[in-house]
């Protein structure tokens, strides 16, 4: 960066070289080049050279003045013009960042995805600083009162064995950057409350040609919970609302949900689930799309493919067809 | 068992500088542990002045009176932590303790045997 | 920022009195609160923590319990040992940037 280069001289800012964005601020330089009384001093601005505000303090010094500065990065050098020199002579250079405090970290949730060995702390951290800002994540036993404390940038895994004092836990964050420490409040966990059961996942479905047409989805999860609450919501593709029906779930086999469908009209359906009682739901799988037939038999081996028929089968449809979802935020 | 050892009593002129040092021996000092310094002014009570944590990171907290008054450092190499001022002043003369359980907790089972600040013109 | 406010001030007691301390903080600290003990001229020395724990070598007279934001220390039995100043602390959490002490202010007890 610009800060590496040898100076003859000296530049500063006031309040500072990272500062509040939309402030004022006044950038001196210095120059200290033998054998030159500058006859002018320049400021430049990522290479652009500035024309107004700069002000002459003394024979070696010269302030550059910024109202309302509100770049979060600028590099910024300064040259002296000195007699009998051609070119203008490099006094130093800084570089200056604009930003915020970071504010209150709100919204702190961790959760362990079972199988992953982790639990994953996530936390809304607010408005954006545009400067570095750095996370500790204080997990403390309620149990034993050690604390540990984990540094990032963002979210954060937490290896659960290292997570040695006991189940109950308080989880808070501290957010610092240069501009300011905010503290989010003390969340408390147990362990055995915050597992998210293995992703349930829609394999296929097919709809059958009865007096009444009936579609069956068939799902699974890998999930050794026992109790398990799960939701499945689905609509026609052109439509806004869902439809959500829930279950309570026994993953020892393949779970059949039997819906009574429109004909010839494209579906879209996900689902997800949670250990009964507890707070925290699965993301929505990803979504998986089934064309039920018009009165005609007619199976779908892709839901992105052209209609094949097979006119001699009692299953007038079946669908694989997945897309991923990119709403899977719903774990609160 | 862990002791602590502050250095010697001090007698200085405001506007000086001071550092004072607590030197741990039987904490692990490759585990998570707080070392945390309390003030104690003539005939008054217990003041907590700031913690250093010192684990993964180094993580320093102040009481919001002592920001910006005293900096708080370690050395984990030497196991020792340390309090300084950059001016100090009169109403800096207090008997300074560090205190620590020597891991990450914040109750403190271990003192040093205190260290006499006397600020004086 | 949380406040621990600790009282009686001081107290007149004689040997063999039950004598209790309280302490409350402005703000759910859970169990996280130490006792200590401090005799004139010499560091201070811990009594209990986690609200009722008794740390190691200390006499089963003393107890503590309480947790949220009340808490008491009791000496079941006061001995001439016992005189003395006893101070709650808020074990908590110390990263808060607006904490003020985590020490109550003190309780005197001396001799009847």
């Known amino acids: 960066g610009i800060t590496n280069i040898n100076c003859s001289g000296h530049i500063w800012v006031e309040p500072a070289t990272i500062f509040k964005m939309g402030m004022n601020i006044s950038i001196y330089c210095q120059a200290a080049i033998k054998n030159c009384q500058p006859r002018k001093l320049h400021f430049y601005k990522n290479g652009i050279k500035e024309r107004f505000q700069i002000t002459r303090i003394n024979k070696t010094t010269a302030r550059l003045w910024y109202k309302n500065f509100l770049e979060p990065h600028a590099s910024m050098y300064c040259t002296a013009e000195c007699p009998k020199h051609f070119q203008e002579t490099l006094i130093c250079g800084k570089d200056i960042s604009s930003g915020y405090p970071p504010d209150i970290p709100d919204e702190v949730t961790c959760v362990i995805y079972e199988y992953s060995g982790n639990m994953t702390c996530t936390w809304n951290a607010g408005k954006l600083t545009y400067i570095d800002t750095k996370y500790v994540v204080h997990v403390k036993s309620l149990e034993t009162e050690e604390e540990q404390q984990y540094l990032t940038s963002s979210y954060i895994n937490i290896s659960t064995d290292s997570l040695q004092g006991g189940k109950k836990y308080l989880v808070w964050v501290q957010a610092a950057n240069a501009l300011g420490m905010e503290e989010s409040k003390q969340l408390q966990i147990h362990l055995d409350d915050i597992v998210i059961p293995s992703a349930a996942v829609i394999s296929r479905a097919e709809t059958i040609n009865a007096t009444v047409p009936k579609t069956i989805i068939y799902w699974d999860s890998q999930t050794t919970i026992e109790k398990v609450s799960c939701e499945m919501r689905y609509k026609a593709t052109t439509n806004q609302t869902w439809n959500v029906k829930e279950f309570d779930t026994n993953f020892t086999y393949v779970q059949q949900s039997e819906f009574y469908l429109e004909p010839n009209i494209k579906y879209v359906f996900q689902v997800r689930c949670q250990e009964t009682g507890k707070r925290y739901w699965q993301p929505w799988s990803s979504l998986f799309f089934h064309k039920t037939p018009e009165t005609v038999p007619q199976v779908t081996s892709k839901a992105f493919q052209h209609d094949t028929w097979n006119s001699g089968l009692t299953v007038a449809s079946i669908s694989t067809g997945h897309l991923t979802s990119d709403n899977r935020g719903d774990i609160g | 068992e862990v002791q602590l050892v502050q250095s010697g009593a001090e007698v200085k002129k405001p506007g000086e500088s001071l550092k004072i040092s607590c030197k741990g021996s039987g904490i692990d000092f490759n585990s998570n542990y707080y070392m945390c310094w309390v003030r104690q002014m003539p005939g008054k009570g217990l003041e907590w002045m700031g913690c250093?944590?010192?684990?993964?990171?180094?993580?320093?907290y102040y009481a919001n009176w002592a920001k910006g008054q005293v900096t708080i450092s370690a050395d984990k190499s030497i196991s020792t932590a340390y309090l300084q001022w950059s001016s100090l002043k009169a109403s800096d003369t207090a008997m300074y303790y560090c205190?620590?359980?020597?891991?990450?907790?914040?109750?403190?089972?271990?003192w040093g045997q205190g260290t006499l600040v006397t600020v004086s013109s | 920022d949380i406040q621990m406010t600790q009282s009686p001030s001081s107290l007149s007691a004689s040997v063999g009195d039950r004598v209790t301390i309280t302490c409350q903080a402005s703000?759910?600290?859970?169990?996280?609160l130490a006792w200590y003990q401090q005799k004139p001229g010499k560091a201070p020395k811990l009594l209990i923590y986690?609200?009722?724990k008794l740390a190691a070598g200390v006499p089963s007279r003393f107890s503590g319990s309480g947790s949220g934001t009340d808490f008491t220390l009791t000496i079941s039995s006061l001995q001439p040992e016992d005189f003395a100043t006893y101070y709650c602390?808020?074990?908590?959490?110390?990263?808060?940037?607006?904490?003020?002490?985590?020490f109550g202010q003190g309780t005197k007890v001396e001799i009847k």
């Open positions: 703000e759910n600290i859970y169990s996280f």
């Open positions: 205190a620590t359980s020597g891991s990450s907790v914040l109750y403190f089972k271990f």
């Open positions: 986690s609200a009722s």
């Open positions: 602390q808020q074990t908590n959490r110390y990263s808060n940037p607006d904490i003020y002490n985590v």
């Open positions: 250093i944590y010192v684990g993964s990171h180094v993580n320093t």
